[in-house]
């Protein structure tokens, strides 16, 4: 359980938070997603990164760094001014995520247009857009601070840059993988259920017949179903008991105004983690 | 067993359009990204287009990008490739390919490919 | 002229090794892509030889091997075989290309004797 900061700590100064969850500690829950999230840390007085776990925790996690800073700091929006810089952003900086079609797992980097920030995102590993850099240190110096006037040589190069056609993207799930999200709106961080246990069973394109477990989102149960050795997705498990353990938590009731509700949540980042299929 | 079908190439005059089909068999056609690659006579291959398993992300090389559309119908198992505005060094053989299937990014499983030959 | 460079032709007698290199930049292998190897018999489609660097799909047999460093890849043949002589292609994505898929130009592998 999370535990509360003890506001009158002589270290924290006077600086109050806004809400009494601003407080409280980063509390990863006992699930094991990998989620990337932010919490207002009252120490530093400022809004970190931390990795959550997709069930649990408390109020004090936020999808991005803006929804942070708005939630949790004194005065942030009266203050937070646009950069003023002469430079010229190149156009795919103001693409969306793209985390492309394939299943891969690569740590890359994009500008957010939002939060005017460069910041990490899970890649595929193939196709997406020109949003997305290796390193943290490109991504800034080409979107984030981007040099004042282009000699007539950078001018043309960026004009490679200009649009991308490329891509119309439905980003909630690829291949019925899950890919990165992002959140374009402020919501309740209740409990986000594992997305890949709301897909339907699939045995796969080879022809072994290996028995595994489904999590069957209907019935609420982990149902056995052949699995012929590769392909599929990952509502896919070796036995039942890991099969409810990673899907049957993403059912919780949560307590709001003496309502009962029961939600089930895409989580923004999930680490996708593959059972050999080969 | 798993099987990828393409129809509908044939000999076309430049300008003209021409659509693709590739019948797929044997898979759940649904939960797998598609792609064409094309082949010119006697040369290398190319990549050419790829969607998502729902339809929702399409992905197109700069030289069809604007004159091509890719497209899926996941109740027919069926992947499409419309196109338009064809030029002479569209002339290939073309081929559906299911996109990281058991691998994380490859060309898992290709078809045996339709000729699509541009010429006045 | 292809994103990727491969030799045009490599050659080998019977029960020998040879390798097939792909050399790429920054932007492609050196970006961390996966490197992927197809292998065209004559007159047929391409078949998925060697995926993700390394690994071999069921029923590719262990004689041939791939493997990635900096911005170039090779598949290696060992023992070769007269059912070998084809085209070999390695294919990986380019982040200057927005991603999209890259060939290389192709390696003519013929099996002497």
């Known amino acids: 359980l999370s535990e509360e900061a003890d506001d009158t700590d002589s270290e924290l100064g006077s600086m109050k938070p806004l809400h009494t969850f601003c407080a409280m500690k980063a509390d990863d829950g006992p699930c094991k997603a990998m989620i990337r999230s932010y919490f207002f840390n009252m120490y530093t007085h400022q809004c970190e990164e931390f990795i959550y776990g997709g069930c649990e925790g408390n109020e004090n996690r936020f999808d991005t760094l803006e929804e942070c800073k708005k939630t949790c700091i004194p005065g942030y929006e009266k203050t937070a001014v646009k950069a003023a810089s002469g430079a010229e952003r190149p156009d795919f900086c103001f693409l969306e995520e793209d985390p492309g079609l394939c299943r891969g797992y690569m740590k890359r980097y994009l500008y957010n247009n939002q939060t005017k920030q460069c910041e990490r995102f899970v890649y595929g590993g193939c196709l997406g857009n020109r949003n997305n850099f290796e390193t943290l240190d490109e991504c800034k110096k080409i979107c984030e601070n981007p040099v004042h006037s282009p000699s007539p040589v950078n001018e043309v190069q960026m004009s490679d840059y200009v649009t991308d056609g490329n891509t119309v993207t439905d980003r909630s799930t690829v291949n019925n993988i899950v890919v990165p999200q992002s959140p374009k709106v402020p919501r309740r961080r209740d409990y986000r259920g594992r997305p890949w246990c709301l897909q339907p069973a699939d045995s796969g394109l080879c022809k072994a017949s290996e028995r595994r477990f489904y999590y069957n989102s209907a019935t609420g149960k982990c149902h056995r179903f052949n699995y012929t050795g590769c392909g599929g997705n990952n509502n896919n498990f070796t036995t039942r008991r890991r099969c409810l353990r990673s899907c049957k938590t993403g059912l919780i009731k949560n307590k709001s105004k003496g309502v009962v509700k029961i939600q089930r949540r895409k989580a923004p980042f999930v680490k996708v983690v593959y059972e050999s299929i080969n | 067993e798993v099987q990828l079908l393409e129809s509908g190439g044939g000999l076309v005059q430049p300008g003209g359009s021409l659509r693709l089909s590739c019948a797929a068999s044997g898979f759940t056609f649904s939960s797998y990204a598609m792609s064409w690659v094309r082949q010119a006579p006697g040369k290398g291959l190319e990549w050419v287009s790829a969607?998502?398993?729902?339809?929702?992300?399409?992905y197109y090389a700069d030289s069809v990008k604007g004159r091509f559309t890719i497209s899926r119908d996941n109740s027919k198992n069926t992947l499409y490739l419309q196109m338009n505005s064809l030029r002479a060094e569209d002339t290939a053989v073309y081929y559906c390919?299911?996109?990281?299937?058991?691998?994380?990014?490859?060309?898992?499983?290709w078809g045996q490919g339709t000729m699509v030959t541009v010429s006045s | 002229q292809s994103v990727l460079t491969q030799p045009p032709s490599v050659s080998g007698a019977p029960g020998q090794r040879v390798t097939i290199s792909c050399t790429g930049s920054s932007s492609n292998i050196g970006a961390g892509y996966d490197v992927h190897w197809y292998q065209q018999l004559p007159g047929t489609a391409p078949k998925l030889l060697i995926y993700?660097?390394?690994n071999r799909p069921s029923g590719v047999p262990d004689r041939f091997s791939g493997s990635k460093s900096g911005t170039s890849a090779s598949l290696a043949i060992t023992g070769l075989q007269a059912e070998d002589e084809a085209d070999y292609y390695c294919q990986s994505y380019d982040s200057s290309l927005s991603g999209s898929g890259v060939f290389g130009g192709g390696t003519k592998l013929t099996v002497l004797g």
């Open positions: 390919a299911i996109l990281g299937a058991t691998s994380l990014s490859a060309f898992d499983i």
């Open positions: 993700g660097n390394s």
């Open positions: 969607i998502s398993g729902s339809g929702g992300s399409t």
